[in-house]
Interface confidence: medium
């Protein structure tokens, strides 16, 4: 049988068939940021290529020996796992090494910082196919090795980094924490978060996904042909590098962005135990699970979105929270959340051309969470229309009036510290779709988007007394881009989406012992776009043998039983 | 391969225009800022990254390096330029005394300081 | 133990180049800046130049920087000093130094046992 | 450059005598400086850095001291296997500049 790790991120079309030919990946050139590599290991003989950059600090203590076996032994699993023969993830994907790492598995940002400009010149010398840079190390939270890593990502290189070992935020460690990093961290064979002695993966909002990275069997560098289990969020990122490699071969014009949404879009979802992070971190951190996809056809009509998180706010009164999207994708919709309730909602903002998603924090809150909806919509043409608290007991209203532009999402912001009790109604006027609706003293804000093909409709789901969560899902084959609760009152803590599920969180009933404040009603504004749908049957029409689907049913491969090593 | 020293000239003439009062003076209303690591085992103090503003030029960068050179010998410190960064951010990885910290936030196209500090194997 | 052992002798024509290593052992290689210092027969010694750590930056002596090159090999601990249009008074010996940064110090705490060149027509 | 102005160029003295060696620098080096000793046909080897640092192994003996343009290297009992060339360094701007050297001869 093949590894668990591999069987884990294999479609399960395609378990039975074993895994994937050894040409995947073989556009894509992979980089290596770590210790130094056993380059002669038959794993990776002929696939990686010892790079003569080193920039690494002299080892601790007088008494350390330096052991080869030892100095590679980072560097050269990770390798393995990447692009191995046997083991590996992308068995096509070139690689490169750079030693940032010495002996004892310790680097300096200002080394790193270094590599990363090397990986820059080089590509600026000899450009070539896709580039995909694994940073399998961590430091702390570093304002100048995340703007590296933002410039390296926004010259088209994609950057992927373990979430680090830590049982801790990933936010306060670099690269980790950079937005524009795809940040991995790791799971076992039951999907569980990983466990390292007294700590484990990192966690939170900083983390986009994870991946196998317990227990995983690849090259050792005691030996040519040794094997050995290893364990980390490294091991997690060099898989996801593997995915990112796979998928960038079959499809290399992807970009960044395009990326990381599929690279979520085809997770495992909801199948790890959240109880494992600490009960604050669990509705930041990802329920996702790395992925190959099972082709790549198909995937180029689907509007792809995702949700991020802002930092927290903080609790002072007028403290607000930020969250952004990546250059390349549009806010569709802004939500907010926070654990006391007292928030004074949120607004979609223009901030250095872009829209934001800003969350306000009112007076006795403990913070607040801004909430965006990023999605993938090219050609779109998106603009924010507000009205301002009407007053009245209907309520507020406003709706998209330009032609052709429709709902994404609604938000609504409110300048009174407690909204109390005011009910405006909760159904909306039929045969008005393209309307937001909310409490008559908040101020209301409809993004409205104009995009080839696109259509939306509004889903909601009424609960007459209050729940602790509120969902509604949109159904297959439609995105959802916009979460938001009706109506806006206190007892309210925010509304955000996880996957393709509106979430509506409301304040335990049992803890504040009243009923009366009424139904909650969670709105999905689910959307699909008919264009890119044609696109892609078009694409399909007139290419083949490219897909990973191909490359999956072109060749089945056993798996090769070795002396395993274990630590 | 780069000679990031130039002419020698140029650091006596900026060891003398600081003396006459001459020297360059950061841009009105921006201030830099020092950065370092918040766990305190992992700081590397006396290595920093000099990061200077986002159009800086290489030029610019050898320029600010050796004039923070030049104010640092006056005052008795030595400072030793490990790299000069260019393709990816503007700046330079400098070793010198804390102490030069105030001396350095305060050269002409500076947008940060980070005292360099460790990462590790994952 | 820590030691930088240099190349073997050379007798070389004027006009002609000769490139020189110095192979590090005993420590980590991309620690050090490596320095090269030359001395004539009988006479003083004088600096020539300066490699980084990684090999990203050097710095010359203004009378040899059009005919100098310095670079590093890490993959090999090695580090390489080319003079290219030599002249007869280029006939020295040349070592390598390792630099060691301590605090607000620095200097040449090692050095290689120097190589021979001699420019002869 | 600075120029290194070393003094005296050469000089006889007994095992036990005390013998002081002095650099002159032309500007103002502050404490950037460092002494080595050189025997026929070897490499150099560090003294002292930092003008009154002695470095790891060094006996005693051999003290630096000055600051600015003026530095002396003294051995305050000379032995047998100090006879030697001596030279004095500065490394407080570029180019890093050599005084011309003492020979310390036997008498």
């Known amino acids: 049988s093949i590894p668990w790790n591999l069987e884990r991120i294999t479609p399960p079309r395609y378990r039975a068939d074993e895994y994937q030919p050894p040409d995947g990946g073989s556009l894509v050139e992979v980089y290596l940021l770590d210790t130094s590599i056993q380059s002669d290991h038959r794993e990776i003989e002929g696939r990686v290529m010892v790079t003569d950059f080193e920039n690494v600090p002299e080892e601790d203590g007088t008494r350390f020996h330096r052991q080869a076996s030892k100095c590679d032994s980072h560097g050269t699993h990770l390798a393995g796992v990447v692009s191995g023969r046997d083991a590996g993830v992308a068995k096509g994907a070139s690689m490169r090494s750079l030693r940032v790492l010495n002996c004892q598995g310790k680097g300096t940002v200002s080394g790193t910082l270094i590599g990363l400009e090397f990986i820059r010149k080089s590509q600026l010398v000899q450009p070539v196919g896709p580039l995909v840079v694994l940073l399998p190390l961590a430091g702390g939270y570093s304002r100048v090795l995340n703007a590296a890593c933002q410039r390296l990502a926004r010259a088209g290189v994609v950057l992927v980094t373990a979430a680090g070992n830590f049982r801790d935020d990933a936010c306060l460690y670099s690269p980790a924490s950079a937005p524009e990093v795809i940040t991995v961290g790791a799971t076992n064979a039951q999907d569980q978060p990983v466990t390292l002695g007294t700590l484990g993966t990192n966690f939170g909002r900083c983390v986009d996904l994870f991946a196998p990275g317990e227990d995983i069997i690849g090259a050792s560098s005691d030996c040519s042909t040794c094997f050995v289990s290893q364990s980390g969020t490294s091991q997690a990122a060099a898989h996801v590098a593997g995915i990112a490699a796979m998928m960038l071969s079959a499809e290399p014009e992807l970009t960044l962005a395009e990326l990381r949404q599929r690279l979520i879009h085809f997770s495992a979802k909801d199948v790890i135990n959240e109880a494992w992070f600490p009960e604050d971190q669990r509705v930041l951190t990802p329920n996702l699970v790395a992925a190959l996809p099972p082709s790549t056809h198909g995937a180029g009509w689907q509007l792809f979105c995702r949700t991020v998180w802002s930092a927290h706010s903080g609790p002072t009164r007028m403290a607000t929270a930020v969250a952004r999207c990546a250059p390349d994708e549009e806010l569709l919709s802004c939500s907010s959340f926070s654990r006391s309730g007292k928030r004074r909602g949120e607004r979609m903002e223009a901030q250095g051309g872009k829209l934001v998603c800003r969350a306000h924090n009112a007076f006795g809150g403990e913070g607040v969470y801004a909430i965006a909806r990023c999605c993938l919509l090219p050609q779109a043409n998106c603009s924010v229309h507000t009205a301002p608290p009407a007053e009245a007991s209907m309520g507020t209203r406003v709706h998209c009036h330009q032609q052709g532009h429709v709902l994404t999402g609604c938000s609504s912001h409110w300048e009174v510290e407690d909204l109390g009790t005011h009910k405006p109604p909760v159904l909306r006027p039929r045969g008005q779709p393209n309307q937001c609706v909310g409490h008559r003293e908040a101020s209301i804000h409809a993004s409205c988007c104009h995009a080839p093909g696109l259509e939306c409709k509004v889903k909601e789901h009424g609960i007459p007394a209050p729940q602790e969560q509120v969902t509604v899902a949109c159904e297959e084959g439609w995105t959802l881009t916009g979460c938001s609760a009706l109506p806006g009152t206190s007892h309210v803590l925010g509304a955000y989406a996880v996957d393709n599920t509106c979430v509506v969180r409301s304040r335990d009933v049992s803890t504040t012992g009243s009923t009366s404040e009424g139904a909650v009603t969670a709105v999905a504004i689910c959307c699909r776009s008919r264009h890119l749908a044609q696109a892609s049957q078009e694409l399909q029409g007139s290419t083949s043998g490219s897909g990973l689907n191909d490359i999956f049913e072109a060749q089945k491969i056993e798996w090769h039983e070795h002396h395993h090593h274990h630590h | 391969q780069e000679d990031e020293d130039g002419d020698y000239e140029e650091l006596v003439l900026a060891l003398r225009s600081e003396e006459d009062g001459l020297a360059e003076a950061p841009e009105h209303g921006t201030t830099a800022t020092f950065h370092r690591c918040a766990k305190d085992p992992w700081r590397l103090p006396g290595t920093y990254v000099v990061v200077l503003k986002e159009e800086t030029h290489l030029s610019q960068s050898e320029r600010t390096a050796r004039r923070l050179q030049a104010q640092a010998a006056r005052r008795g410190y030595l400072t030793k330029i490990l790299h000069v960064f260019h393709g990816l951010l503007p700046g330079f990885l400098v070793k010198m005394s804390g102490d030069l910290l105030e001396l350095a936030l305060k050269l002409p196209h500076v947008d940060y300081i980070e005292e360099d500090s460790s990462v590790f194997a994952q | 133990q820590v030691q930088l052992v240099q190349s073997g002798a050379e007798v070389k024509k004027p006009g002609a180049s000769v490139k020189v290593s110095c192979k590090a052992s005993?420590?980590?290689?991309?620690?050090?800046?490596i320095h090269w210092v030359r001395q004539a027969p009988g006479q003083g010694l004088e600096w020539m130049g300066e490699?980084?750590?990684?090999?990203?930056?050097?710095k010359f002596n203004q009378k040899f920087k059009d005919r100098v090159t310095m670079t590093r090999d890490t993959s090999i601990s090695t580090a390489y000093m080319e003079l290219s249009r030599l002249r007869s008074d280029d006939t020295a010996v040349y070592y390598c130094?390792?630099?060691?940064?301590?605090?607000?110090?620095?200097?040449?705490?090692?050095w290689g046992q120097g190589t021979t060149v001699t420019v002869s027509s | 450059d600075i120029v290194m102005t070393q003094s005296p160029s050469s000089l006889s003295a007994s095992v036990g005598d005390r013998v002081t060696i002095t650099c002159k620098a032309s500007?103002?080096?502050?404490?950037?400086v460092a002494w080595y000793q050189q025997k026929p046909g070897k490499s150099p080897k560090l003294l002292i850095y930092?003008?009154?640092n002695r470095y790891t192994g060094v006996p005693s003996r051999f003290s630096g001291s000055g600051s600015g343009t003026d530095f002396t290297l003294t051995i305050s009992s000379l032995q047998p296997e100090d006879f030697a060339t001596y030279f004095c360094?500065?490394?407080?701007?570029?180019?890093?500049?050599f005084g011309g050297g003492t020979k310390v001869e036997i008498k």
């Open positions: 130094a390792r630099e060691r940064i301590y605090s607000n110090y620095w200097f040449f705490d090692v």
């Open positions: 005993g420590y980590t290689f991309t620690g050090y800046t």
């Open positions: 490699i980084n750590p990684s090999g990203t930056y050097t």
């Open positions: 500007q103002n080096v502050y404490t950037a």
């Open positions: 930092s003008a009154s």
């Open positions: 360094q500065q490394y407080s701007s570029y180019p890093y500049t």
